[in-house]
Interface confidence: medium
């Protein structure tokens, strides 16, 4: 709305940088062939690039990434009894970000 | 995968709490009747509840919210010239979070 301007602070751009995000650990990251199990924990924190850039046609992208393996519990319920196994999920953390030009493919003439 | 367990740290649950997120300011928040304008800044930071809860059938939800009006620029392009106007967008910040039971409607018998 265009009203109540007085009380409003000027909006500050969310700069392009790494922020803590929540990553849901989906079961198919652990086992694509079986669905009869649970994963614990169901979500973890990751560092990801987000925010906006000062110009159009540029996008906030990761310029440096790091893969981080973490152990999760794979909990299979077999005959009403849980079987716990360790599984490794590899998370991707963004270490640095940059505003990168979006390359749009030129139409073939 | 179940391999390379040694190098992996145990995964830590992303607890239910407020985190800084990036909110894209869409044009229809400012003017639903007109699309011939740009908004600056295109995105801002907000505080939002995210993460997982320790138990089944519970979800991370905001328990306290605050509305925060911010001023943005509405940039209309008229005859190839920009016209700057002020507009107010009301953002929603989450101040506190809680793990809340998901009420699933019972089937009617």
């Amino acid at each position: 709305s265009l009203g109540s301007l007085a009380a409003a602070e000027p909006a500050v751009i969310a700069e392009c940088k790494t922020r803590t995000e929540v990553f849901q650990i989906s079961r198919n990251l652990i086992d694509r062939t079986n669905a009869n199990f649970l994963v614990w924990p169901p979500c973890v924190e990751v560092q990801r690039c987000s925010g906006c850039c000062n110009n159009r046609n540029v996008q906030c992208r990761a310029s440096q990434v790091q893969m981080r393996p973490v152990q999760v519990r794979k909990i299979e319920i077999v005959r009403k009894k849980p079987i716990f196994k360790k599984a490794t999920v590899t998370l991707e953390d963004h270490l640095a970000c940059k505003c990168e030009t979006i390359v749009t493919p030129r139409p073939v003439t | 995968s179940l391999g390379s367990l040694a190098a992996a740290e145990p995964a830590v649950i992303a607890e239910c709490k407020t985190r800084t997120e990036v909110f894209q300011i869409s044009r229809n928040l400012i003017d639903r009747t007109n699309a011939n304008f740009l908004v600056w800044p295109p995105c801002v930071e907000v505080q939002r509840c995210s993460g997982c809860c320790n138990n089944r059938n519970v979800q991370c939800r905001a328990s306290q919210v605050q509305m925060r009006p911010v001023q943005v620029r509405k940039i209309e392009i008229v005859r190839k010239k920009p016209i700057f106007k002020k507009a107010t967008v009301t953002l929603e910040d989450h101040l506190a979070c809680k793990c809340e039971t998901i009420v699933t409607p019972r089937p009617v018998t």
């Epitope: 649970l38 614990w40 152990q71 519990r73 909990i75 319920i77 077999v78 009403k80 009894k81 849980p82 079987i83 716990f84 196994k85 360790k86 | 367990l5 040694a6 740290e9 145990p10 320790n54 138990n55 089944r56 519970v58």
Partner: antibody, heavy 120, light 107 residues
Amino acid sequence: EVQLLESGGGLVQPGGSLRLSCAASGFTFSSYAMSWVRQAPGKGLEWVSYISDDGSLKYYADSVKGRFTISRDNSKNTLYLQMNSLRAEDTAVYYCAKHPYWYGGQLDLWGQGTLVTVSS
Amino acid sequence: SYELTQPPSVSVSPGQTASITCSGDSLGSYFVHWYQQKPGQSPVLVIYDDSNRPSGIPERFSGSNSGNTATLTISGTQAMDEADYYCSAFTHNSDVFGGGTKLTVLG
């Protein structure tokens, strides 16, 4: 205050029965798995039985299978262990303990224990 | 049935590092927890999921687990750390405890 309080222990003859209770307070009992662990005099810890948050999953140590039954009443915040056909080797301090998750995990809260003596 | 083996006793001088081992077949494939029990008291969790410390447990307690052996390490051991220590793992549908290790702080 978060706590677990066991009761129901005592002296019982071999072949007899006993029902242990564990009253939980200070946390949402219905959200967590629970276990019973015992410790014979001068000996180490022995896990006895487990029950998930809603009671749908239960399992027992081989040494008590078929004789002991674990149950819970979430409306009363209470865990139970029904012990039948008791033997001298069941003599121990019985602890109830809380898991941090609905499915189990480590035991992050223990009661003070209740002594069960099986003797003629 | 699955067994966890601990040394019956470990002795350490105050200020030194104490290491208590827990061994079992492919133990590194399971999450190991450690409990401390002082005479006449209930057990207390000191390490969970191999290497995590619950709040309130001093930083001198640490843990590791790989291969067939999990280790509880107490650095800068204090007199108050004298107790029985039990490792535990959830394996094959049952929680298993090691036989326990009596830690004696000399002096």
